[in-house]
């Protein structure tokens, strides 16, 4: 679930089995020129990023319950 | 690597206190959260609760509530649990665990500590 | 709190054979199950978590499947070093709650 910085696709590979409890933002990078696949990063609880799969049940999950926080803030 | 080293043995007074400790090593304490459970002689495992050392935030099960506190130390990277008020059901071994940061799935655990409350 | 019911409590096999054990949540999980291997005198071991992914250095024999209420985890080619006791435990919502365990002996 590695992370890189330069200017193409971040997630080099995503983490399986991610639980809600230490996620503690989500960021959704839309596909664009330098990556043409959506990219879920989740900040955790101890500062790590962590990549996710977009195409997850419980990732997609996640993000919607995110946003909606979001928007109730 | 990973290891959680749990304090020794205890043999304690009903009615008196108990603190018992996990040090560990090998990775950053104050990053995961560690949990602590229980399992009574002849009898399976019961989750107590868990802090997370890098601000002190901690969870606990409702028949925890009241029983005893977990504390961290992040300086000697050492996690605690007292227990108070010692009667003959706190009679256990009492097992500390480190939860993986993205999962939270426990995936190192201490060797117990025994808890022997007798007068 | 969710509820874990696990079954059998107990169960013997025979060597090179397979064996089952299920548990049931009270509510939908979401997957969030593990399982552990307790041997008397150690650590619980964890075995699997969300469900099916295998812990690293846990040999292939080892499976778990499952959903919604109900998940269940076998062992195939049953090895002596197998015997202990198996808990599964639930970490959808605080508080984790284990189920009763099952112990496994050898025939």
């Known amino acids: 679930a590695s992370v890189a910085t330069e200017l193409r696709c971040q997630c080099l590979q995503t983490l399986q089995g991610i639980h809600p409890k230490n996620i503690q933002s989500v960021n959704v990078k839309s596909p664009g020129p330098h990556c043409a696949q959506t990219e879920v990063i989740a900040t955790l609880k101890n500062g790590r990023k962590a990549c996710l799969n977009p195409a997850s049940p419980i990732v997609k999950k996640i993000i919607e319950k995110m946003l909606n926080s979001d928007k109730s803030n | 690597q990973v290891q959680l080293q749990q304090s020794g043995a205890e043999l304690v007074r009903p009615g008196s206190s108990v603190k018992i400790s996990c040090k560990a090593s090998?990775?950053?304490?104050?990053?995961?959260?560690m949990n602590w459970v229980k399992q009574r002689p002849g009898q399976g495992l019961e989750w107590i609760g868990q802090i997370y050392p890098g601000d002190a935030d901690t969870n606990y099960s409702g028949k925890f509530k009241g029983k005893g506190t977990l504390t961290a130390d992040k300086s000697s990277s050492t996690a605690y649990m007292q227990l108070n008020s010692l009667t003959s059901e706190d009679s256990a071994v009492y097992f500390c665990a480190r939860e993986r940061d993205y999962d939270v799935a426990m995936d190192y655990w201490g060797q117990g500590t025994s808890v022997t409350v007798s007068s | 709190d969710i509820q874990m019911t696990q079954s059998p409590s107990s169960l013997s096999a025979s060597l090179g054979g397979k064996v089952t054990i299920t548990c049931k949540a009270s509510q939908d999980i979401n997957k969030y199950i593990a399982w552990f291997q307790h041997k008397p005198g150690k650590g619980p071991r964890l075995v699997i978590h969300y469900t099916s992914i295998l812990q690293p250095g846990i040999p292939s024999r080892f499976s778990g499947v499952g959903s919604g209420r109900d998940y269940s985890f076998s062992i195939r080619n049953l090895e002596p070093e197998d015997i202990a006791t198996y808990y599964c435990l639930q970490y959808d919502n605080l508080p984790w709650t284990f189920g009763g365990g099952t112990k496994l002996e050898i025939k």
């Open positions: 090998g990775y950053a304490f104050s990053d995961y959260w």
